[in-house]
């Protein structure tokens, strides 16, 4: 039967819930599907039921709330029907789900060398997601960096921060490195998707030699 | 019974700080959400702050963010806002209320329980 | 911000009279309005909450009602203890938003 696989709100404002909606070999042929939903501000279950405001904004087997239908203070109830009958149900705060788009515009500066030229420190740079509307303050993200060389599998995670920048220490010079970021909503919801990958190629040895080398 | 009771009111020169406390009984603050209200002298009522200590989220009107703290102690049932760069304007009663959660994902539309005040009065 | 515009500001009224109080929310907020009593000195009282269900404890002459975005309180009966001003407020956007209030007076 079709089951929520999940639901999700970028920044608070808005939210968008997905569905299976696999035909199982041997299941009798479901009528369509259809997403009803109730904000639960009673305590009763009597309460109005209506149905899914926006079938096509978040894609296939998807409802979307937009900030007309979405608010965060009284948690809401939804449900999946077919042919009359309740296939799926399941209740939560708009808290509860948020989980921010990736962070944007990853950049790097060198901040130093050792004095052997073999590791470098970097500054890794970064932009909350557009629509995270941080500058409004219903959004206090926090983010995790990861980075790792390019030829190992294991990403090397760094403690979360509140900041859109952090110094990475001790990288091998002239290797190559893979950093990504990802954000959540600060003591609530889950971590967004990873941002692009940011590669950092740090120069050779001699591209870092000072001029007191040659006296 | 339930009750709230602020404290932590005073004057205070502009630029100053001060942290007022809304003491909570008769509920577990981990399963409610806290308001702070404020009104000024002769005014209406303006909404200052939330958290929800369950979900750890908390939201600001514009006029106070950056400068306003809220926070909660869950294990002293207290909810604090901590208030810096205090300005003549923020001169009011401040209020903390609640907003009920109750069982399976229901929540009031509405403050049920208010303290009973606590004046800050910010003048040089 | 949903601005909740409250009217009248002020009324005076008679012991026995029916008094009416209305809210426009300059968008729609669903039926997330609460009405507040305030007397001086004192924390406001919950009378009203999701528009149109009477807190508990609050006496059956007053209401709430919805029109669209036009929400009404409505005292069917004065009573001397209802001298106080009444606030709407609504709980649907952020910030949260409270008209302006509305004092009634003795006539």
């Known amino acids: 039967e079709p089951k929520f696989t999940k639901c999700r709100s970028p920044e608070r404002e808005t939210f968008s819930c997905h569905w299976t909606d696999e035909v199982h070999h041997g299941t009798k042929n479901l009528g369509p599907i259809q997403l009803f939903y109730t904000r639960r501000n009673t305590q009763e279950w009597t309460q109005e039921w209506k149905e899914c405001p926006d079938y096509v904004s978040a894609g296939e087997n998807s409802c979307y709330f937009n900030s007309s239908f979405t608010s965060i203070w009284i948690p809401y109830c939804i449900k999946l029907t077919s042919n009359g009958g309740t296939v799926d149900e399941k209740c939560f705060s708009v808290d509860e789900i948020v989980q921010p788009d990736p962070p944007i515009a990853l950049n790097w500066t060198l901040l130093n060398v050792s004095l052997t030229g073999i590791h470098a420190d970097i500054q890794v740079r970064w932009e909350a997601p557009r629509n995270a509307d941080i500058q409004k303050g219903w959004m206090v993200l926090e983010y995790e960096l990861q980075y790792k060389e390019v030829n190992e599998t294991k990403w090397k995670m760094m403690d979360p921060i509140l900041t859109t920048s952090v110094p990475v220490y001790s990288l091998k010079v002239d290797k190559e490195y893979e950093v990504r970021v990802r954000s959540k909503q600060r003591n609530s919801g889950n971590y967004g998707e990873f941002s692009e990958v940011l590669y950092v190629t740090l120069p050779q040895m001699s591209q870092f030699t000072c001029e007191e080398d040659f006296y | 019974e339930v009750q709230l009771v602020e404290s932590g009111g005073g004057l205070v020169q502009p630029g100053g700080s001060l942290r007022l406390s809304c003491a909570a009984s008769g509920f577990n603050l981990y399963s409610s959400s806290i308001h702070w209200v404020r009104q000024a002298p002769g005014k209406g009522l303006e909404w200052v702050a939330y958290?929800?200590?369950?979900?750890?989220?908390?939201y600001y009107a514009d006029s106070v963010k950056g400068r306003f703290t809220i926070s909660a102690d869950t294990s002293k049932n207290t909810a604090y806002l901590q208030m810096n760069s205090l300005r003549a304007e923020d001169t009011a009663v401040y209020y903390c209320a609640r907003q009920y959660y109750g069982y399976h994902y229901y929540a009031q539309e509405a403050f049920d329980y208010w303290g009973q005040g606590t004046l800050v009065t910010v003048s040089s | 911000d949903i601005q909740m515009t409250q009217s009248p500001s002020s009324l005076s009224a008679s012991v026995g009279d029916r008094v009416t109080i209305t809210c426009r929310a300059s968008q729609s907020v669903s039926s997330a309005v609460a009405w507040y009593q305030q007397k001086p000195g004192k924390a406001p009282k919950l009378l009203i909450y999701s528009a149109s269900s009477l807190y508990s404890g609050v006496p059956s002459r007053f209401s709430g009602s919805r029109s669209g975005t036009d929400f009404t309180l409505t005292i069917s009966s004065l009573q001397p203890e209802d001298f106080a001003t009444y606030y709407c407020q609504q709980f649907w956007g952020t910030p949260i938003t409270f008209g302006q209030g509305t004092k009634v007076e003795i006539k």
């Open positions: 958290i929800s200590s369950s979900y750890g989220s908390t």
